[in-house]
Amino acid sequence: QFLKEGQLAAGTCEIVTLDRDSSQPRIEERSQTARCACRKGQIAGTTRARPACVDARIIKTKQWCDMLPCLEGEGCDLLINRSGWTCTQPGGRIKTTTVS
């Protein structure tokens, strides 16, 4: 039951960093994407501010805070119309994430 090279364990995700040079000299574009191997009944989401496989019901019902998307110690609140969520740090700083 060993994983092949590049194979993800079921239920896990990894962050893939894509580097590519643009046509402009000395300018490098860097973007990140997530690769997940979710189990049946799961879908890619966000847990503790990182990509994770989460219960598909959470996405279906748009109960985003049930993914536990915020870091420990932060407060999670749904945006109006459940269009995303906010993470509020103890100091009051708010990070907003919208779901398209």
């Epitope: 239920g11 896990t12 847990t47 496989c53 019902t61 109960q63 049930d66």
Partner: antibody, heavy 120, light 107 residues
Amino acid sequence: QVQLQESGPGLVKPSETLSLTCTVSGGSISSYYWSWIRQPPGKGLEWIGYIYPSGSTNYNPSLKSRVTISVDTSKNQFSLNLKSVTAVDTAVYYCARVNPFGYYYAMDVWGQGTTVTVSS
Amino acid sequence: DIQMTQSPSSLSASVGDRITISCRASQSISTSLNWYQQTPGKAPRLLIYGASTLQSGVPSRFSGGGSGTDFSLTITSLQPEDFATYYCQESASIPRTFGQGTKLDIK
């Protein structure tokens, strides 16, 4: 640090409803999942179910028709109701915090447990 | 439901010994496997999650391994406080299921 404390009656009559509450102190109930587990005398652990911050739940199918787990975020508490109890429901009942360690959900903080006896 | 089977059910050992407890899942659970320790009259304590990651504060004499269906918990150089009952638990599906437990006592 986070501490959990179960409370509720230690004796319940057959056919009645077992009701327990777990009070969470030292942390916010909204940042984790929360679980109930039981252990009959001299036996192993049985997972009852867990609850999400929104109040959404997952239950053990073997108990699903009789169990309700609810959360009161304003009181930092979550509760277990088990209806139509019989002697086989006699057990130590534990509440626990479910921590998402990356992708590996594990119960990392437990209450000390409360013994519930079902007897007339 | 996924069935979790532990072996042996009981084990006698001495302080300083090295022991291994096995846990087998009825179907593949990747590395979604946790280990707990329980002493009489106390609540279980998380030792290892994700099959091999040691929980904070747990001594390094405890280690876990395996993936798929076969897992193990090893304790090197047993200490008096290690004599307890150990449970594996899968976290890959609903319901979460525990093994029946392995009772470790002093020889």
